[in-house]
């Protein structure tokens, strides 16, 4: 190319279909300057133009030659270029933004634009270019990419953006612009130009304003608020911490905040102040709902369904902002709707769904929803298994007869298709308590009724009973007790009988014991006493209760004595026993020592005694007869403890073994003892008999039986030389070697000679007796021997 | 239990002054905004002044600004209003009342609770 | 500074009925700045609501308070004889703190 001939030679395109080619004009040319453009490849193509561009359609691939001949005043010149589509540049169209509008509630800008897609032929990718610039500034806050598709029909694209700062603080610049990657083109790809700005502004009122108003954020999050102001800010704080300001366009403010910590229930205050003025905002910082924990559904009725949770983790926000739950059932579609206006801690949440008509499998769902978030739950469950049962109501006991009663309750629900397994706890009054267990047809109704037997008669009992379905979910609460007497029956036993002779030996005096209270089965009002022997039978009057002795003038002939309790409703089965007693010449009294609250007596064997042995006990010291108690035990027993409240320590009992055979009684053996030994509580009284220049004789008399509180074993005599009245060491007292003790273990010995002693001396003597309760207390004397002669 | 109580009212002519005390029990007075309102005779609530926890900042209402002045004594617990230049609209009943909430736990600006029972100002010639 | 107006001015009701008492702002007003107090001749006023909706301590909850915006509401489900009183709302988001000029609650 010459020089001053047409130069720089440029070929764009927007749309691949055509080309804009244009030069630089020779220098020197003016206005009157004509070109002649030939494109040439396998044909030759030319046009007249007068300016230094021209558009072609799109030419195929391979070179062409271009030559552009200018035509002026002062001549001609002509250049040659070689045009390939490499050396065209894809430049699109300089976008245009249609709308750009904002939601200043969540601070969120949003943008459409078209992309004219209908000029470009051909499928195309596009990036755009999306700049956010922020104050009257323009300082730059967000730069984006956002890839489309040209599909040759124009196309709106559209993008949103939430910003960080409330978009009421500045004011927001929005401009775009395209990029087209074509894969077919070979040339060059370049950006278009920036649309057009649009701009997004708040117009104040009067009032400062501080924005976001009443936001709920997640804690931990960062926040920008503001103030928009027409006076000077001076200061910003969150909660009753400073902030440092960022300043904005004017006098508006900005403050950012950081992890922000857990508001309290009524949120946390965020201030700016002025001059003269305080402006606030209160911020929410809390949790999306947690997972609900436990979700548990079950029914008391099989009429309606109670859902129950844990809500988890605390939100931290309440009222309005306070998690709302909805429970779902899937396969009917229905839901229910629950709104807490408070939350708290760790309580547990619950619902109710009214149940459904044919329908025991329900799959629920329970979302959580807060403005932060949302959570699920989900159960399947089979209603019909997971009944947990009303308390029981309206209890009550009536009797059928004196060994069976019948219960009856309410259980409000339709539970005409499944079982009960119920549980009664009977209780008597000082007995252990019995569980029984019973299966009930559930019914529709919801009373119940069931018969409970093998009860016993006259009999205070404590009634409760809890249900649960047969396919165990859980028990209900249990029913109030309900105390119930069952009705008399006859006694079921005779008394328990026994006879002594009184001490004259004329009259037989008859006792018995009242009749345990399962035995006398009601109030005992009276006993019948009467005697039989081979020729006649004999009544006494009625004996009322609580009378349980009498007595009966007979001779030596044998007797069966009959005793008999009667109640309101019958008469017991008589008690018998002879009068006669077998005599037994081959009698020894034994000595027998308890174990502290008893006594054990054992024998031997004995076939010949068929109907049972009797212990009968008293206290020795008691005239005759001598009565305390008695107590029966089978024939094949061969020992036997007796215990009793009235057996104090150290008090002698007599004890008497007797044998019954053919109606009557022996006597086998008689043992006086102790339930326990303890030591005698009197020294035994003695006196000097006798005294030498070198002997003294003492004698000393029995303990009385009730002193000696056991069995005397022995007794310790002590002596050694000591005066009265001086500072002398006593006999008892420790570290004496020259003390002598004799163990007198002869219990039936009275006196002691003591010998070799110092004529005119004087002897402290010391007496004191022993049982296997221990030693007794001491009598002491000071005797004087006689001079030697 | 939380209680307020005002003193220090009574007639008093126009132009000249008047110091009104609340005295604060039964909470941590240092921890909360306090406040001023006054109510004339028949008529509404109006607002008149708040002092912050600490003392630092005190707004007023325009129609006292210049003329009364807040302020507290931490260590008495105890709130007072200077009133200076005193005109016959400021007669009223003069409330303290105490921020609903603690600075220290959701900041400033909250609700009025409680309140004392009242301290009658009467500004007459 | 925000100004609320209180209607109706009195409401005359029986004892039993239900009482709605309306606040309106002259500007937006954050439901968390807006209280409805009680006040009763003779004696302070006692807070009933703030943060629009929540009930302050040992409020019977008879007393509801709803409302965002410019429009907020008092509602007493079932008058008894101690709420016949003067209620006002109060907005404390922005200074100057301003009262409305109080709804009277009388017996019919």
């Known amino acids: 190319q010459k020089k001053g001939a047409p130069h720089d030679l440029k070929c764009v395109t927007n749309n691949l279909q055509v080309w804009n080619c244009s030069w630089k004009a020779p220098s020197g040319t003016g206005r009157g300057t004509d070109y002649e453009v030939c494109i040439e490849n396998r044909s030759r193509s030319c046009y007249q133009l007068e300016k230094t561009s021209i558009k072609i359609p799109a030419l195929s691939h391979g070179d062409y030659e271009i030559t552009i001949n200018s035509l002026h005043d002062f001549g001609s010149s002509t250049s040659k270029f070689t045009l390939n589509e490499q050396n065209v540049s894809l430049i699109p169209d300089t976008p245009e933004i249609l709308n750009l509008s904002a939601d200043f509630s969540t601070s969120t800008l949003y943008l459409k634009w078209n992309d004219r897609g209908s000029v470009f032929p051909h499928r195309s990718n596009v990036i755009w270019e999306i700049k956010v610039l922020r104050k009257e500034s323009m300082e730059l806050v967000k730069l984006v990419t956002h890839n489309t598709t040209l599909n040759g029909k124009d196309t709106l694209h559209h993008w949103s953006w939430a910003s960080d700062m409330p978009l009421e603080c500045a004011i927001h610049f929005v401009e775009i612009r395209c990029y087209i990657d074509n894969l077919h083109f070979s040339g060059l790809e370049e950006w278009s130009d920036w649309s057009p700005v649009k701009n997004i502004s708040w117009i104040p009122d009067s009032q400062t304003k501080v924005f976001p108003q009443d936001k709920v954020i997640l804690v931990g999050s960062d926040i920008t608020f503001c103030c928009v102001s027409q006076e000077k800010v001076l200061s910003a704080l969150i909660g009753h911490t400073n902030c440092p300001l960022i300043h904005l366009d004017g006098e508006n403010v900005a403050i950012k905040i950081r992890n922000i910590s857990v508001s309290a229930s009524s949120g946390t205050n965020v201030v700016f102040t002025t001059e003269d003025n305080i402006f606030g905002t209160v911020i929410f910082a809390g949790y999306p709902p947690d997972t609900p924990q436990q979700l548990n559904c079950e029914t008391h009725d099989l009429k309606e369904i109670i859902c129950s949770w844990n809500p988890g983790r605390v939100t931290a926000l309440v009222g309005p902002r306070a998690t709302s739950y909805t429970l779902v059932e899937s396969f009917s579609g229905k839901y229910v709707r629950l709104k807490r206006a408070e939350a708290p801690t760790n309580e547990s949440y619950q619902l109710l769904f009214q149940m459904l008509p044919n329908q025991e499998i329900y799959n629920f769902t329970l979302n959580a929803h807060n403005p932060l978030g949302r959570s699920q739950s989900t159960i399947l469950v089979n209603i019909t298994e997971k009944v947990y049962p009303h308390t029981p109501t309206s209890f009550k006991v009536k009797d059928i007869n004196s060994t069976a009663v019948k219960l009856s309750w309410h259980l409000p629900g339709n539970f005409a298709k499944i079982n009960f397994l119920c549980e009664i706890e009977i209780k008597k009054s000082n007995s252990v308590q019995e569980q029984r267990n019973v299966t009930i047809k559930g019914v529709e109704n919801s009373s119940y009724l069931v018969a409970l037997d093998k009860l016993n008669p006259y009999t205070l009992y404590t009634f409760r009973i809890r249900c649960s379905t047969e396919t165990f979910w859980k028990w209900s609460k249990w029913s109030n007790k309900k105390q119930h007497l069952t009705t008399e029956a006859s006694p079921s036993k005779g008394p328990d009988t026994w006879r002594e002779w009184s001490s004259d030996g004329k009259n037989l005096i008859i006792y018995w014991k009242p009749l345990p209270i399962n035995e006398a089965n009601g109030k005992i009002l009276s006993y019948n006493v009467s005697c039989s022997s081979d020729e006649e039978t004999q009544s006494l009057s009625e004996i009322p209760d609580p009378q349980h002795k009498a007595e009966i003038r007979l001779d030596k002939n044998d007797y069966i004595i009959s005793v008999v309790a009667k109640n309101s409703v019958g008469s017991s089965p008589p008690s018998k026993i002879a009068s006669m007693e077998i005599p037994n010449d081959d009698l020894k009294i034994e000595q027998v020592v308890g174990m502290g609250k008893g006594i054990l007596l054992t024998w031997h064997y004995d076939p010949n005694m068929t109907c049972d042995y009797v212990i009968k006990w008293c206290n020795s010291s008691r005239s005759e007869p001598c009565l305390m108690d008695w107590r029966k035990v089978p024939s094949n027993s061969t020992e036997t403890v007796i215990e009793s409240d009235e057996f104090r320590p150290g008090i002698r009992y007599n004890f008497f073994l007797y044998g019954c055979r053919n109606q009557g009684y022996q006597l086998l053996r008689s043992m006086i003892g102790y339930i326990e030994e303890l030591a005698p509580i009197v020294a035994p009284n003695f006196t000097v008999e006798d005294t030498s220049a070198d002997s003294i004789l003492v004698k000393w008399e029995d303990i009385p039986v009730e002193e000696l509180r056991g069995f005397l074993r022995g007794y310790l005599f002590y002596f050694g030389k000591g005066e009265r009245d001086t500072s002398k060491m006593r006999v008892l007292e420790s570290g004496r070697s020259d003390i002598k003790v004799k163990n007198i273990t002869d219990i039936s010995q009275k006196t002691l000679r003591i010998a070799d002693l110092q004529g005119k001396t004087s002897y402290h003597l010391v007496l004191r007796a022993y049982t296997d309760g221990g030693v007794g207390p001491e009598k002491s004397m000071y005797v004087v021997t006689k001079e030697n002669s | 239990q939380v209680q307020l109580v005002e003193s220090g009212g009574g007639v008093v002519q126009p132009g000249r002054s008047l110091r009104l005390s609340c005295a604060a029990s039964?909470?941590?007075?240092?921890?909360?905004?306090m406040h001023w309102v006054r109510q004339a005779p028949g008529k509404g609530l109006e607002w008149v002044a708040v002092i912050w926890y600490d003392g630092n900042n005190k707004y007023y209402a325009d129609s006292v600004k210049g003329r009364f002045t807040i302020s507290r004594d931490n260590s008495k617990n105890t709130l007072y209003l200077q009133m200076n230049s005193l005109r016959a609209e400021d007669t009223a009943v003069y409330y303290c009342?105490?921020?609903?909430?603690?600075?220290?736990?959701?900041?400033?600006?909250?609700?009025?609770?409680?309140w004392g029972q009242g301290t009658l100002v009467t500004v007459s010639s | 500074e925000i100004v609320l107006t209180q209607s109706p001015g009195t409401l005359s009701l029986s004892p039993g009925e239900r009482a709605t008492l309306s606040c309106r702002a002259s500007q937006s007003v954050s439901s968390s700045y807006l209280a409805w107090y009680q006040q009763k001749p003779g004696q302070a006023p006692r807070l009933l609501i703030y943060g629009a909706s929540s009930r302050a301590t040992g409020i019977p909850d008879r007393f509801s308070g709803s409302g965002s915006g410019t429009d907020f509401t008092l509602t007493i489900s079932r008058l008894e004889p101690e709420d016949f009183a003067v209620y006002y709302c109060?907005?404390?988001?922005?200074?100057?703190?301003?009262f409305g000029p109080g709804t009277k609650v009388d017996i019919k």
């Open positions: 109060q907005q404390y988001g922005s200074s100057p703190f301003t």
């Open positions: 009342a105490r921020d609903g909430e603690s600075s220290m736990v959701r900041g400033l600006l909250n609700w009025f609770d409680p």
């Open positions: 039964g909470f941590t007075f240092s921890s909360y905004g």
